[in-house]
C-alpha cells in the first residue's frame, strides 16, 4: 500500500497497526480487531472502523424533511460482523444470539429477532441526510460559500466524488448535507457515501480517524464553523421493516 510507504503509518486510518512485512517488504497496515489489510490511499470501510473501535484498548433553500422511512442510528456502538471486503454482513447478532438486519451503513433496519432471523441481502443506503446545527455566529454564513466549502471538504478530505454530494441546504443555524449514491452509480474505487459520512461524523465529534492530521478545522471565508449538534438520517433503496409497535412508540 504505497500511501503508507514512507514511515509505515496509515494516513487515512489511525485504527491500524502497520509493519514492514507486506509484499516485497513494503509497509502493510492492518485494521485493529479484524486483522484485515487496509488500503491506506482511501477511506476504510465503516464496518472495519467500528470493529476496530470495539477492539481498541479502553483507551432550494428549504430544509429537507426526512422521509418516514429514514433511519437514525439509535442503537449506537456494537461489534459488527464484516464480510471479506470489509462491508457489513446483512445479519448482525450479539453474544446473546439476538439478531437483526442492517443496511450498508450498519444501521438496524428490522426488529430484533433470534438466530432464525433471515436477512436475504445487504440493502444499500442510497441517500444520507446529515443535519447539523452550528453555534451562534455574528451573522449567517453566505449560502454559496458554505456550499462550496462543504463540497470541497467531502472532495478533498474524504475523497468523495462531487457528484455524490447532491445538495447543501442552509437555514441558520441548520445545515443539511445530502449525499446520494445508487448501486448503479458507484464505480469501483469510488468512496462509499456511508464511509464518507462516518468519517465526517467522527471529525465533527472531534474524534478524527485520520492519522496525525489535526482535527477538522472548518472555516467559511475565515469564519469558524462550529457544530453543536449532528443528526444523520439514512434512506435505504428498500424501506426498512419494523413492526407497527415500534412505529407507534
Amino acid at each position: 500500500h504505497t500511501a503508507a510507504q514512507d514511515n509505515c503509518t496509515c494516513p487515512t486510518n489511525k485504527m491500524t497497526v502497520c509493519s514492514p512485512d507486506g509484499p516485497g517488504g513494503r509497509c502493510q497496515c492492518r485494521a485493529l480487531g479484524s486483522g484485515m489489510a487496509v488500503d491506506c490511499s482511501t477511506l476504510t470501510s465503516k464496518c472495519l472502523l467500528l470493529k476496530a473501535r470495539m477492539s481498541a484498548p479502553k483507551n432550494a433553500r428549504t430544509l429537507v424533511r426526512p422521509s418516514e422511512h429514514a433511519l437514525v442510528d439509535n442503537d449506537g456502538l456494537y461489534d459488527p460482523d464484516c464480510d471479506p471486503e470489509g462491508r457489513f454482513k446483512a445479519r448482525q447478532c450479539n453474544q446473546t444470539s439476538v439478531c437483526w438486519c442492517v443496511n450498508s451503513v450498519g444501521v438496524r433496519r428490522t426488529d430484533k429477532g433470534d438466530l432464525s432471523l433471515r436477512c436475504d441481502e445487504l440493502v444499500r443506503t442510497h441517500h444520507i441526510l446529515i443535519d447539523l446545527r452550528h453555534r451562534p455566529t455574528a451573522g449567517a454564513f453566505n449560502h454559496s460559500d458554505l456550499d462550496a466549502e462543504l463540497r470541497r471538504l467531502f472532495r478533498e478530505r474524504y475523497r468523495l466524488h462531487p457528484k455524490f454530494v447532491a445538495a447543501v441546504h442552509y437555514e441558520q443555524p441548520t445545515i443539511q448535507i445530502e449525499l446520494r449514491q445508487n448501486t448503479s452509480q458507484k464505480a469501483a474505487g469510488d468512496v462509499d457515501i456511508g464511509d464518507a459520512a462516518y468519517y465526517f461524523e467522527r471529525d465533527i465529534k472531534g474524534e478524527s480517524l485520520f492519522q496525525g492530521r489535526g482535527g477538522l478545522d472548518l472555516r467559511v471565508r475565515g469564519e469558524p464553523l462550529q457544530v453543536e449538534r449532528t443528526l444523520i438520517y439514512y434512506l435505504d433503496e428498500i424501506p426498512p421493516k419494523f413492526s407497527m409497535k415500534r412505529l407507534t412508540a
Epitope: C8, V17, S19, P20, D21, G22, P23, Q28, R30, L32, S34, G35, M36, A37, D39, P57, P84
Partner: antibody, heavy 116, light 111 residues
C-alpha cells in the same frame, strides 16, 4: 541476523499455568507482530494469536481466548505467552514467529507437557 | 473462520519430477493487488520455514525450484525438480482476517 529464542521445555501439572518466552534479536522488536502457533502431533499447526509490541495490541483466535494471554516487554525485546488451566489437550510444541501471517522467522519451539 | 483445505494429504514424487500441492480457501483471500496466502515447509523436529509469501513471492534463500501461484480461493505450490531434501510436510496459511488459519498439511515423500 534475526533470531527468536524460546524458553525451555516445561513439564506441568493439570490445572496449573505456564508462561513461556520468546526473545527477539537482530531487528526492531516494536515494528513487527509476533505470532504464536500450537502444534500437537498429528494435529498440524494452529494459530493462537499475535501481539504488536509497539503498542501492546493483541489478536486472539476465539478458540484460545481465556486460555492464552500474550504480553511483550519492549525493554528486553521479549514476547510472552501464558497458558492457563492446563489440560492434556494443551500438551504441544508452541512456536513464536515474526510477522502477522507469512511468519519469516520462527523460534525453535517450547515443548509443554501436561501430566499428573 | 476461513477454512483452508490442502490436497493431497500425502504424495510421493520421483526425484527430479514435479510435485504439486493445492490449497483451497473457503472464501477469497485476494484483493486486486495481493493474495494473502503463504506456504511453509516443515521437517521433523524443526519449526516451519517460510517458502512463499503473498501467493507467489519467493522468500530470500529459498531455491527457485519452489514456486507459488493462484488467487481468490485456489492456490498451488509447485516444486520442480524435486530433490531428496524436499521430503517434508508443507502447509498453507492465509493472513486475510483473524484467525490466520493453516491448512491441514501435505506430506511429501521422494521416491
Amino acid at each position: 541476523q534475526v533470531q527468536l529464542q524460546q524458553s525451555g521445555a516445561e513439564l506441568v501439572r493439570p490445572g496449573t499455568s505456564v508462561k513461556m518466552s520468546c526473545k527477539a534479536a537482530g531487528y526492531t522488536f516494536t515494528n513487527y507482530w509476533i505470532g504464536w502457533v500450537k502444534q500437537r502431533p498429528g494435529h498440524g499447526l494452529e494459530w493462537i494469536g499475535d501481539i504488536y509490541p509497539g503498542g501492546g495490541y493483541t489478536n486472539y483466535n476465539e478458540k484460545f481466548k481465556g486460555k492464552a494471554t500474550l504480553t511483550a516487554d519492549t525493554s528486553s525485546s521479549t514476547a510472552y505467552m501464558q497458558l492457563s488451566s492446563l489440560t492434556s489437550e494443551d500438551s504441544a510444541i508452541y512456536y513464536c514467529a515474526r510477522g502477522t501471517g507469512g511468519g519469516d522467522y520462527w523460534g525453535q519451539g517450547t515443548l509443554v507437557t501436561v501430566s499428573a | 473462520d476461513i477454512v483452508l483445505t490442502q490436497s493431497p494429504a500425502s504424495l510421493a514424487v520421483s526425484l527430479g519430477q514435479r510435485a504439486t500441492i493445492s490449497c483451497r480457501a473457503s472464501q477469497s483471500v485476494s484483493t486486486s493487488s495481493y493474495s494473502y496466502m503463504h506456504w511453509y515447509q516443515q521437517k521433523p523436529g524443526q519449526p516451519p520455514k517460510l517458502l512463499i509469501k503473498y501467493a507467489s513471492n519467493l522468500e530470500s534463500g529459498v531455491p527457485a525450484r519452489f514456486s507459488g501461484s493462484g488467487s481468490g480461493t485456489d492456490f498451488t505450490l509447485n516444486i520442480h525438480p524435486v530433490e531428496e531434501e524436499d521430503t517434508a510436510t508443507y502447509y498453507c496459511q492465509h493472513s486475510w482476517e483473524i484467525p490466520y488459519t493453516f491448512g491441514g498439511g501435505t506430506k511429501l515423500e521422494i521416491k
